[in-house]
């Protein structure tokens, strides 16, 4: 039961996390105008990964997309790439984990296959979360660097006569959404990996199997065979017989051709 709960919770947490990563990637408020030096501005600037926006005194907001690829800073391109990779990995991870869920029965899928898929999706979620956290952190670092650079040249004036306040940017809501979402995806991935250990058949008990050698009647009853990881082990040529009743979370043997869902 604990394995099912851990796997299910991991899936839900990852789902929320990936939804958050998608939301953060699409959000316009990655960086927002710092109002510390100009709290009375009637024009509020904010920027996302894909476009920059200006909210005017009328309440009207105008957004302009970055219609260039080559003209954009390499760091911004890197952040975009990290977020997209995070989303793609997360989406694939979600797809894989749906089939890996213990509560969902698909055909005669073996438990080792489900364990495999759970681990795969878990790793994908971990990498997806790390990509998101890395992307957001790179952008945040870029903001901090630019903030202090623009603070150093805060005022660019015409012969010192006219003061032109340079627009400085600070952390936008998307950064916090991204960090939290990345963290959730990471946690979800770890939970999936933990669940995978419970799903894997740690110990496969063989029932008495008679091997009839020619001329002799010898009954061979082997002891418990320790599977190395529970998945990926060579189960070819192993004849495994289904034991009696078992609970949902107990180690399941591979279903025979007569085990239908």
């Amino acid at each position: 039961m604990a394995v099912t709960a851990c796997q299910g919770l991991g899936f839900v947490v990852s789902l929320i996390g990936i939804a958050g990563i998608i939301a953060a990637t699409c959000m316009d408020q990655w960086s927002t105008q710092d109002l510390y030096n100009n709290p009375v501005t009637a024009v509020f600037n904010y920027q996302g990964l894909w476009r920059s926006c200006v909210r005017e005194s009328s309440g009207f907001t105008e957004c302009r997309g970055y219609f260039t690829l080559l003209g954009l800073p390499a760091m911004l391109q890197a952040v975009r790439a990290l977020m997209i990779v995070g989303i793609v990995l997360g989406a694939i991870g979600l797809l894989v984990s749906i089939f890996a869920l213990k509560c969902i029965r698909i055909g005669s899928m073996e438990d080792s296959a489900k364990a495999n898929m759970t681990l795969t999706s878990g790793i994908m979620f971990i990498v997806s979360g790390l990509c998101a956290i890395a992307g957001v952190s790179v952008f945040a670092n870029m903001l901090v660097t630019n903030f202090w650079m623009s603070t150093a040249n805060m005022y660019t004036g015409m012969g010192g006569m006219v003061q032109t306040v340079q627009t400085r940017y600070t952390f936008g809501a998307a950064l916090f959404v991204g960090w939290v979402a990345g963290g959730l995806t990471l946690i979800g991935g770890v939970m999936m990996c933990i669940a995978c250990r419970g799903l894997a058949p740690e110990e496969t008990n063989y029932k008495a199997v008679s091997y009839h050698a020619s001329g002799h009647s010898v009954a061979y009853k082997p002891g418990g065979f320790k599977a190395s990881t529970g998945f990926g082990s060579n189960t070819k040529n192993k004849k495994i017989y289904d034991g009696g009743a078992r609970t949902e979370d107990e180690v399941q043997s591979y279903p025979s051709k007569h085990d239908y869902v």
Epitope: V43, N45, S52, V162, T167
Partner: antibody
Framework: QAYLQQSGAELVRSGASVKMSCKAS????????IHWVKQTPGQGLEWIGY????????NYNLNFKDKATLTAATSSTTAYMQISSLTSEDSAVYFC????????WGQGTLVTVSA | DIVMTQSPSSLTVTPGEKVTMSCRSS????????????LIWYQQKPGQPPKLLIY???TRDSGVPDRFTGSGSGTDFTLTISNVQAEDLAVYYC?????????FGAGTKLELK
């Protein structure tokens, strides 16, 4: 086409309060701020402040902070401005305006303060 | 507060001529976020509310004749009327749309010679 219809002229006693309205039509009321502007022959045009009908937020010119109160009723798409403790200096035409670059203005409400 | 200074305070013109009026702000109205200047020009005739002519220093509002041209950047702005008509006789105001409180110039009155 956006349109702002302001309430009629007011003749009020000194020390009293007056509340004028600005009925909006032809645009999404919650999408734009409604600004209020005072015009007197001596002082010219003065910005009083704005109300944001979408979230109820407002911003005032400090000169009018204790004088004017801006509100909005989204149900009736109407913005209101109340001016309190009226003096002769408050005798003016008050406009409401909205849209990009204040593209739309009400016809104005003339407030006359009598002694 | 940003102080808006308009000059001249009045202009006497004859129909058909070109007119320029100036507006100067005490602080820059330039927004580096979108590289635009937040200055507005209005025309006001007696008994009427101000009418928007130009916003963002140079963007003509819809329906405004192309004889009205806004220019300038930072702190110095100009409104040019290339071919003055009789209906253009009015008071012209500039407004800071960049920083609160929004402030207006005292106006330039266009009068017939």
């Amino acid at each position: 086409q956006a349109y702002l219809q302001q309430s009629g002229a007011e003749l009020v006693r000194s020390g009293a309060s007056v509340k004028m309205s600005c009925k909006a039509s032809g645009f999404t009321f919650t999408s734009y701020n409604i600004h209020w502007v005072k015009q007197t022959p001596g002082q010219g045009l003065e910005w009083i402040g704005y109300i944001s009908p979408g979230n109820g937020g407002s911003n005032y010119n400090l000169n009018f902070k204790d004088k004017a109160t801006l509100t909005a009723a989204t149900s009736s798409t109407t913005a209101y401005m109340q001016i309190s403790s009226l003096t002769s200096e408050d005798s003016a035409v008050y406009f409401c305006a909205t849209g990009r670059g204040f593209a739309y203005w009400g016809q104005g409400t003339l407030v006359t303060v009598s002694a | 507060d940003i102080v808006m200074t308009q000059s001249p305070s009045s202009l006497t013109v004859t129909p058909g001529e070109k007119v320029t009026m100036s507006c100067r702000s005490s602080q820059s109205l330039f927004n580096s976020g979108n590289q635009k200047n937040y200055l507005i020009w209005y025309q006001q005739k007696p008994g009427q509310p101000p009418k928007l002519l130009i916003y963002r220093a140079s963007t003509r509002d819809s329906g405004v004749p192309d004889r009205f041209t806004g220019s300038g950047s930072g702190t110095d702005f100009t409104l040019t009327i290339s071919n003055v008509q009789a209906e253009d006789l009015a008071v012209y105001y500039c407004q800071n749309d960049y920083s609160y409180p929004l402030t207006f110039g005292a106006g330039t009155k266009l009068e017939l010679k």
